[in-house]
Each structure stands twice: as structure tokens, then as C-alpha cells.
């Protein structure tokens, strides 16, 4: 049994890091393998992660972490029974994938303005709380070409757009994702999408 693709890990910079790897053949990850991880710190203890299958030869493990600070470094040991298959390390702050924003809501009762709001996925005491920026994706269910991205580079988790920038009388969907420039993170997954019917009063033409 050998590792074909070494584990690569990403952290949500809060409580979970996810590691994925590939074996050289079909493997029952949960019965044959264990991923041991330990924070390089005086008070820490080793923890064991039981991997799950992720495709035939692929495995994935969700490492639970109490808390994350930028200096943290973890040792990783992948075992098959008594055999050490791979040894490595992982610095969560260098491989951050933020959590997806939640509670995306479209408020359509503000005159002819659409107000989209969502929740920051981090608690206020987490470093990323004040460092997230967002991308909002709005698209038409009827017209695949009607697809747009709004970059929200301020901290407030909201976006205002004129209803008239979208077509009237049709349904739209929106979703939002996050990233943090400070840690050069990847983008988060998209939030679940929300749907609304766009309608607004056409302004009277002046002749």
C-alpha cells in the first residue's frame, strides 16, 4: 500500500482542516488508514483522524482544531496499521479556505433597490471576521447569459443594487462567497442560493 498523491490540507481558520490524498489503488480509508496530527506546542497531544473514502483511491480527513493562530504548525503522520506511509507538516494560516457565508437574504421592499444581506461565517473574536471580502453572483434562471458578479470589497456583508439593473418580471438567484486578502486565501464555497422574482416600476418616458 502506497500514497500516490500526498495529503494536501486546507483550514477554515476556525475549527476544521480538511486533508485529501490518493492511494495507489482502491482503499477502504476508514478501516485501513489513520491520520495522526499534533500541534507543535508544549501542551498539545496527538489526535487521530479516521479518513473517509473520496472516490475509489481517494481519502479525505476532517481534522478538528480547538482554535487557530497564525504561528500554528501541525505534524501529520499517515499510518496503515503499524506502517508509516507518509510524514509531513501543515501550517493552517498558509492554506486557508474560508467558511461559506450564510443566511443570504434578498430584501425587495426597499423602493426600487435590491438589498442583499448575508452573515459573516466567523465569530467576532476570529481574526478573519474583520478581513473578509465577498463576491456576489446573480443570475437569471431563464437566461444563462444573464450572469453577473459583484465584488464587495468593504467589510459590511451587504450589497445594494438598483432593481432596474436586472430584467423585470423574471426570477433571479443569488449566492455569495468569501475570501481574505490578508492570508491570500482561496475562495470559500458558494453559499446556498436564494431566489426572488424581480419586478420594478418602469419609469415613465418623458416626451
Amino acid at each position: 500500500m502506497k500514497v500516490l498523491q500526498e495529503p494536501t490540507c486546507v483550514s477554515d481558520y476556525m475549527s476544521i482542516s480538511t486533508c485529501e490524498w490518493k492511494m495507489n489503488g482502491p482503499t477502504n480509508c476508514s478501516t485501513e488508514l489513520r491520520l495522526l496530527y499534533q500541534l507543535v506546542f508544549l501542551l498539545s497531544e496527538a489526535h487521530t483522524c479516521i479518513p473517509e473514502n473520496n472516490g475509489g483511491a481517494g481519502c479525505v480527513c476532517h481534522l478538528l482544531m480547538d482554535d487557530v493562530v497564525s504561528a500554528d504548525n501541525y505534524t501529520l503522520d499517515l499510518w496503515a496499521g503499524q506502517q508509516l506511509l507518509w510524514k509531513g507538516s501543515f501550517k493552517p494560516s498558509e492554506h486557508v479556505k474560508p467558511r461559506a457565508p450564510g443566511n443570504l437574504t434578498v430584501h425587495t421592499n426597499v423602493s426600487d433597490t435590491l438589498l442583499l444581506t448575508w452573515s459573516n461565517p466567523y465569530p467576532p473574536d476570529n481574526y478573519l471576521y474583520n478581513h473578509l471580502t465577498y463576491a456576489v453572483n446573480i443570475w437569471s434562471e431563464n437566461d444563462p447569459a444573464d450572469f453577473r458578479i459583484y465584488n464587495v470589497t468593504y467589510l459590511e456583508p451587504s450589497l445594494r443594487i438598483a432593481a432596474s439593473t436586472l430584467k423585470s418580471g423574471i426570477s433571479y438567484r443569488a449566492r455569495v462567497r468569501a475570501w481574505a486578502q490578508c492570508y491570500n486565501t482561496t475562495w470559500s464555497e458558494w453559499s446556498p442560493s436564494t431566489k426572488w422574482h424581480n419586478s420594478y416600476r418602469e419609469p415613465f418616458e418623458q416626451h
Epitope: 506546542f41 508544549l42 501542551l43 498539545s44 480547538d66 482554535d67 497564525s70 504561528a71 500554528d72 504548525n73
Partner: antibody, heavy 120, light 106 residues
Framework: DVQLQQSGPELLKPGASVKIPCQAS????????MDWVKQSHGKNLEWIGN????????FYNQKFKGKATLTVDKSSSTAYMELRSLTSEDTAVYYC?????????????WGQGTSVTVSS | QIVLSQSPAILSASPGEKVTMTCRAS?????IHWYQQKPGSSPKPWIY???NLASGVPVRFSGSGSGTSYSLTISRVEAEDAATYYC?????????FGGGTKLEIK
């Protein structure tokens, strides 16, 4: 509100022992370690050791092994440090502090300190 | 054990000035914490794990560094910042403290 309450000053003779209490309130006592720190001459700080109130596990600075013994009473949320065979070198202010893994050993709350004076 | 050397021992600054104090370790460490202490009081939690401000610490304070060299910076000193600042390492047993930098305000 998190509070760590320590006892008042102690004046002791060489060779004596003293047991300093640190009563915790405002948080779940077993969720954090209790660390102890010595401050001599109002300046030098030395880490003595810590105890995990959940399982009673202790972690000492080698220098204080045999000098300090750390214990807890979970029922009263109180940590204790006993110092034995006291000498003038033990004259100092002793602090308890809430620590642990979560903030990488950082003591985020401190007691007000207990002054121990050893004199014949 | 790891020896932490803080410099300068005494730092004198005028209100509004930017000041930096350093903490050098005798060998490489990962986690450095900082505490503030005023005469007659317990040390106060100030900065943890190199750069994270403890609750209630003004944002004019910041921490940085890696390896053997760490620093605490105050962007604009205020009179209330007069105190002694201690660094502490939590990477090698036993955890050790520096000798402190006393900040005086002119």
C-alpha cells in the same frame, strides 16, 4: 465576569510550608489550565507549572519540582499551590493565571497575587 | 532553557510617538506572548501568539516577529501606556519570561 481570587500575604519562617489558594469564578473551571508564576523583587517572572483541573495532570518547570505541588478541588473551583521547605529565596509574589492550549499557553486572567515573605 | 532578552531595558517616549520594543530568544521559538504590568498590580494579558491583541487592548498596539526576534509596537504612545512589558515564550519547556522593558512617558 472571570475572576481568580487569591489569599492575603503570608509571613513565614524558614523551613515552613504554605498552601496558597486560587478560587476561580465566572467560567467552567475544568475547561482551562491553572498556571502559577513567581515574581521576585517586583521584576523577574518565572513560570512554576500548571495543572489541568479536568484530570489533575500537572506540568512543572524542573526548577520547581520538589518545591511546589499543584492540586485542585473541583467542587470549590479552587486551585492550590503548596510551597515547602521555604527559604529566603522563596520570598516573592505568587500569581495564579488561567491558561491552556486554546491560546497557546497565554494567561488571559490573573489573580491579584499572594505575597510570601520568608524571614527568621 | 530559552533565554528571552528584552531591549531596551528602559524606553522613554513622548505622547504621540511611535515606539518599538524587542524580545530576542536564545533559540528559535514559535509562540511569544506579551503582558503589561503597572506597579502594585498583577500582569495584564496584552498580546498572545505573536500578534493577537487580548480583549480590551487598544489597537495602537501590535505584535510581530518570528524565529528568534519579536517586537511589540505602539503606533502612538499615550500616558496610560506607561508600564513594564514582559514577553513570554511557550515553545520549549520551561516557558520563560523576558526581563521586561519599562516604558516611561516624558
Amino acid at each position: 465576569d472571570v475572576q481568580l481570587q487569591q489569599s492575603g500575604p503570608e509571613l513565614l519562617k524558614p523551613g515552613a510550608s504554605v498552601k496558597i489558594p486560587c478560587q476561580a469564578s465566572g467560567y467552567t473551571f475544568t475547561d482551562y489550565n491553572m498556571d502559577w508564576v513567581k515574581q521576585s523583587h517586583g521584576k523577574n517572572l518565572e513560570w512554576i507549572g500548571n495543572i489541568n483541573p479536568n484530570n489533575g495532570g500537572t506540568f512543572y518547570n524542573q526548577k520547581f519540582k520538589g518545591k511546589a505541588t499543584l492540586t485542585v478541588d473541583k467542587s470549590s473551583s479552587t486551585a492550590y499551590m503548596e510551597l515547602r521547605s521555604l527559604t529566603s529565596e522563596d520570598t516573592a509574589v505568587y500569581y495564579c493565571g488561567r491558561g491552556g492550549l486554546r491560546r497557546r499557553g497565554f494567561l488571559d486572567y490573573w489573580g491579584q497575587g499572594t505575597s510570601v515573605t520568608v524571614s527568621s | 532553557q530559552i533565554v528571552l532578552s528584552q531591549s531596551p531595558a528602559i524606553l522613554s517616549a513622548s505622547p504621540g510617538e511611535k515606539v518599538t520594543m524587542t524580545c530576542r530568544a536564545s533559540s528559535s521559538v514559535i509562540y511569544i506572548h506579551w503582558y503589561q504590568q503597572k506597579p502594585g498590580s498583577s500582569p495584564k494579558p496584552w498580546i498572545y501568539a505573536v500578534s493577537n491583541l487580548a480583549s480590551g487592548v487598544p489597537v495602537r498596539f501590535s505584535g510581530s516577529g518570528s524565529g528568534t526576534s519579536y517586537s511589540l509596537t505602539i503606533s502612538r504612545v499615550e500616558a496610560e501606556d506607561a508600564a513594564t512589558y514582559y514577553c513570554q515564550q511557550w515553545s520549549v519547556n520551561p516557558p520563560t519570561f523576558g526581563g521586561g522593558t519599562k516604558l516611561e512617558i516624558k
